[in-house]
């Protein structure tokens, strides 16, 4: 086991962390925008799930050295509509390729201060962080 | 802020946790099996993304009070194949509804022991936990 600088350096433990709880959602660094590339707007017949999907997507790295996990990946849709199951390339306007979002629990490393305000190592602050997980082929919403 | 029982209850801090790091994946409580219901194997024209998808799914709660996050949700596919974009109900055998998996970082509360082996509150142990996020409509793999 390896540890951070201690929040409360007691004899018994090499490192302890204060977990602070907060459920304010934190927006991703960039909006999880659509990212249409006609060249890659196709459903492959092999490879990983995100390339075989008829709503294909790529993953974009979001790295923050003071967050746990440090690396998160945001899905970016490659097509506005779903790709035809028959051809794997032509788009079918009857289906939309939509991002699936999730508020993931993450932890931020923050300076934590003692009673007298002195710096006491690092503490962990829990947050919800919005991540786009995948692109999903859906039927368009019919407004009633 | 709310906290778990303290790992080292010092005067300065209401709660500290020892973070122990391990990356051995932990299997979910139940295998993320397929869960086909012909009655619900349809793509809705309204409602949340998982019901409008042509690879619809439901969520199953996985709760563990000694884990952070305590509540995780596993996707369960409602259809073996994708639903037709045209009808929203008939299945199209040219497309498979497949689970998308992700190894999520979670933290487990474990008893942590002092130098002499005495119980000293709780520690947090980091693990990777396999979660099924969604069902995706994919073109079947063509073996080369």
């Amino acid at each position: 086991y390896s540890h951070w600088p201690s929040c409360c350096p007691s004899k018994g433990y090499p490192s302890e962390e204060l977990l602070r709880w907060s459920t304010v959602p934190v927006p991703p660094l960039k909006p999880a925008s659509l990212d249409f590339h006609s060249v890659s707007c196709r459903a492959s017949e092999d490879g990983p799930l995100n390339s075989r999907a008829i709503s294909p997507w790529r993953y974009e790295l979001d790295r923050d050295l003071n967050r746990l996990p440090q690396d998160l990946y945001h899905a970016r849709c490659l097509c506005p509509h779903c790709v035809s199951l028959q051809t794997g390339s032509h788009m079918d306007p009857r289906g939309n390729s939509e991002l699936l979002y999730h508020n993931q629990t993450v932890f931020y490393r923050r300076p934590c201060h003692g009673k007298k305000g002195n710096h006491k190592g690092y503490c962990l602050e829990r947050r919800l962080y919005r991540v786009s997980l995948a692109c999903v082929c859906v039927r368009p919403r019919v407004m009633g | 802020y709310s906290h778990w029982p303290s790992c080292c209850p010092s005067k300065g801090y209401p709660s500290e946790e020892l973070l122990r790091w391990s990356t051995v994946p932990v299997p979910p409580l139940k295998p993320a099996s397929l869960d086909f219901h012909s009655v619900s194997c349809r793509a809705s024209e309204d409602g949340p993304l998982n019901s409008r998808a042509i690879s619809p799914w439901r969520y199953e709660l996985d709760r563990d009070l000694n884990r952070l996050p305590q509540d995780l949700y596993h996707a369960r596919c409602l259809c073996p194949h994708c639903v037709s974009l045209q009808t929203g109900s008939h299945m199209d055998p040219r497309g498979n509804s497949e689970l998308l998996y992700h190894n999520q970082t979670v933290f487990y509360r474990r008893p942590c022991h002092g130098k002499k082996g005495n119980h000293k509150g709780y520690c947090l142990e980091r693990r990777l936990y396999r979660v099924s996020l969604a069902c995706v409509c994919v073109r079947p793999r063509v073996m080369g």
């Epitope: 390896s2 540890h3 951070w4 990983p48 995100n50 390339s51 790529r58 993953y59 974009e60 790295l61 790295r63 050295l65 003071n66 746990l68 996990p69 440090q70 690396d71 990946y73 490393r109 | 973070l19 790091w21 980091r126």
Partner: antibody, heavy 125, light 107 residues
Framework: EVQLQQSGPELVKPGGSVRISCKAS????????MNWVKQSHGKNLEWIGL????????SHKQRFMGKATLTVDKSSSTAYMELLSLTSEDSAVYYC??????????????????WGQGTSVTVSS | DIQMTQTTSSLSASLGDRVTISCSAS??????LNWYQQKPDGTIKLLIY???TLHSGVPSRFSGSGSGTDYSLTISNLEPEDIATYYC?????????FGGGTKLEIK
């Protein structure tokens, strides 16, 4: 022993494209991110982007978004960079570099700890 | 993007000298700084990561220091094989950025 073996020099016409390969050996290919770096005129180093071989996840410097396409072939432990719509400005030496991560865990530090020998690309008619 | 500046583009020193190469960032990079060595044949090696930690196999005559926006690489006893160009690189935020390089030559 960690090694990154890059493909040989390329001479390409303007408007064309080129694919550079970087074959990794001596470590678990999917366990480390791969970076690509451009060196123009034998001087400045410019980061192009990176790819995680495990999930294909990428990050690019904005100006290389439509220019460089990063891919991997896990079966052969090879990373590729395709450069599109080439102009004389793209003439440079291109390096692949493995990104190592260092303690204290779990808050890693990142550094390009092993580099390929470089691939020279010349764009000329 | 974070700009990295190495104000000295070339530097001459004698064998055995103590040489310091500086690097500054356009904003605080919290010690998230690496140093690389590029030999005249184009070979690039990692020397130091996280401001001051020597990469495995790097001689102890190399050392790094700094904080905030200002960093430096020191070679305590210059050897002939140290003739190279040295680059700093920040990894505080993507995109990664490099300094312009400092070419070290023998007097």
């Amino acid at each position: 022993e960690v090694q990154l073996q890059q493909s040989g020099p390329e001479l390409v016409k303007p408007g064309g494209s080129v694919r550079i390969s970087c074959k990794a050996s001596g470590y678990s290919f999917t366990g480390y991110t791969m970076n690509w770096v451009k060196q123009s005129h034998g001087k400045n180093l410019e980061w192009i982007g990176l790819i995680n071989p495990d999930n294909g996840g990428t990050s690019h410097k904005q100006r290389f978004m439509g220019k460089a396409t990063l891919t991997v072939d896990k079966s052969s432990s090879t990373a590729y960079m395709e450069l599109l719509s080439l102009t004389s400005e793209d003439s440079a030496v291109y390096y692949c570099a493995r990104e190592g991560y260092y303690g204290p865990s779990p808050f890693h530090h990142y550094a390009m700890d092993y580099w390929g020998q470089g691939t020279s690309v010349t764009v000329s008619s | 993007d974070i700009q990295m500046t190495q104000t000295t583009s070339s530097l001459s020193a004698s064998l055995g000298d103590r040489v310091t190469i500086s690097c500054s960032a356009s904003q605080d990079i919290s010690n998230y700084l690496n140093w690389y060595q590029q030999k005249p044949d184009g070979t690039i090696k990692l020397l130091i990561y996280y401001t001051s930690t020597l990469h495995s196999g790097v001689p102890s005559r190399f050392s790094g220091s700094g904080s905030g926006t200002d960093y430096s690489l020191t070679i305590s006893n210059l050897e002939p094989e140290d003739i190279a160009t040295y680059y700093c690189q920040q990894y505080s935020k993507l995109p990664y950025t490099f300094g312009g390089g400092t070419k070290l030559e023998i007097k």
